[in-house]
Amino acid sequence: SEVEYRAEVGQNAYLPCFYTPAAPGNLVPVCWGKGACPVFECGNVVLRTDERDVNYWTSRYWLNGDFRKGDVSLTIENVTLADSGIYCCRIQIPGIMNDEKFNLKLVIKPAKVTPAPTRQRDFTAAFPRMLTTRGHGPAETQTLGSLPDINLTQISTLANELRDSRLANDLRDSGATIRIG
């Protein structure tokens, strides 16, 4: 079953996906697509990386983390209700039936009509840790404790802060993660 993430209309959504490169700069192609992961590649591709760089992207979809270190988490800018649905993160590890795929469910909630400046909101329901082995059994999932409260003024810059903040390290440990090599 898919892991669920939430965001509000007008905000940025964050879908975590990570791998550990076998060696620095030894990148693995990754694709992100709208819709469940199919047999190969990603359907309705929104972003793709190769062994060196991001080689395909569409507007509003970007990698805010350091993809050269295996942080291939997807940020979707200024989401609308139409962005709800399943997203596929596929880490295309070379070999026979080796590639890893993660289906992440994004739920978009309508924006609050008149939010008070002090009101609190969830950035996401949870950042589950996905532990996967080289086998193809079901992923073990474990939900972390609640994230600290984040107010509306903070949330608007959270995506930019993730890269440099301590929270980024927590998130890096809590997304869909695989180790290669």
Partner: antibody
Framework: QVQLVGSGGGLVKPGGSLRLSCAAS????????MSWIRQAPGKGLEWVSF????????YYADSVKGRFTISRDNAKNSLDLQMNSLRAEDTAVYYC????????????????WGQGTTVTVSS | EIVLTQSPGTLSLSPGERATLSCRAS???????LAWYQQKPGQAPRLLIY???SRATGIPDRFSGSGSGTDFTLTISRLEPEDFAVYYC?????????FGQGTRLEIK
């Protein structure tokens, strides 16, 4: 024009080996996933294996895993299927096919097929 | 694996009639990952429909596909003599890629 031409079929004894080839022309071969599909006499279609454009990602049907090896040579625009430990039930027409794609968004369907090459496994 | 069951096994119709072919999946398949093929005796299959409803290049508009989840349909609005063949559905939703057993469309 876009074309796939299969070769290498023939009659082989059970336990024997055979290598099928598929020559591609008219398109940028390395951009596409490629598949082998087979059809036993009077039966339906059965997917056998696919390989990614770079050759790095490979999948097999359970029925051939460990016996068949798919490979490609992008410099020569060729796709191969090495078949070892052949069994009577491997008797079929083998087709190579291109898995369709468009830039950015893949579409899922085999849009170009070879004419098929016949493999008969019999003592 | 996802099993695709096609019905009917054989469909006998006359040119000019409408043909409706069914493909049922044992579990849900995203419509993006369902295709239909036509095969005539002694020939390789030909892609007709991908993404459940998009016509492949060069396919006449009398062929249309529809459906979602577990139930998909190929419709030929007005049969031409060259349409009598075997039709297969196929899914790319999960490994292994699978085909239905086929529906034979024959002249009545």
């Amino acid at each position: 024009q876009v074309q796939l031409v299969g070769s290498g079929g023939g009659l082989v004894k059970p336990g024997g080996s055979l290598r099928l080839s598929c020559a591609a022309s008219g398109f940028t071969f390395s951009d596409y996933y490629m598949s082998w599909i087979r059809q036993a006499p009077g039966k339906g279609l059965e997917w056998v294996s696919f390989i990614s454009g770079s050759g790095s990602i490979i999948y097999y049907a359970d029925s051939v895993k460990g016996r068949f090896t798919i490979s490609r040579d992008n410099a020569k625009n060729s796709l191969d299927l090495q078949m070892n430990s052949l069994r009577a039930e491997d008797t079929a027409v083998y087709y190579c096919a291109r898995d369709g794609m468009v830039r950015g968004m893949n579409f899922y369907g085999m849009d170009v097929w070879g004419q098929g090459t016949t493999v008969t496994v019999s003592s | 694996e996802i099993v695709l069951t096609q019905s009917p096994g054989t469909l006998s119709l006359s040119p000019g009639e409408r043909a409706t072919l069914s493909c049922r999946a044992s579990q849900s398949v995203s419509s993006s990952y369902l295709a239909w093929y036509q095969q005539k005796p002694g020939q390789a299959p030909r892609l007709l429909i991908y993404g459940a409803s998009s016509r492949a290049t060069g396919i006449p508009d009398r062929f249309s596909g529809s459906g979602s989840g577990t139930d998909f349909t190929l419709t030929i609005s007005r049969l031409e003599p060259e349409d009598f063949a075997v039709y297969y559905c196929q899914q790319y939703g999960s490994s292994p890629i699978t085909f239905g057993q086929g529906t034979r469309l024959e002249i009545k």
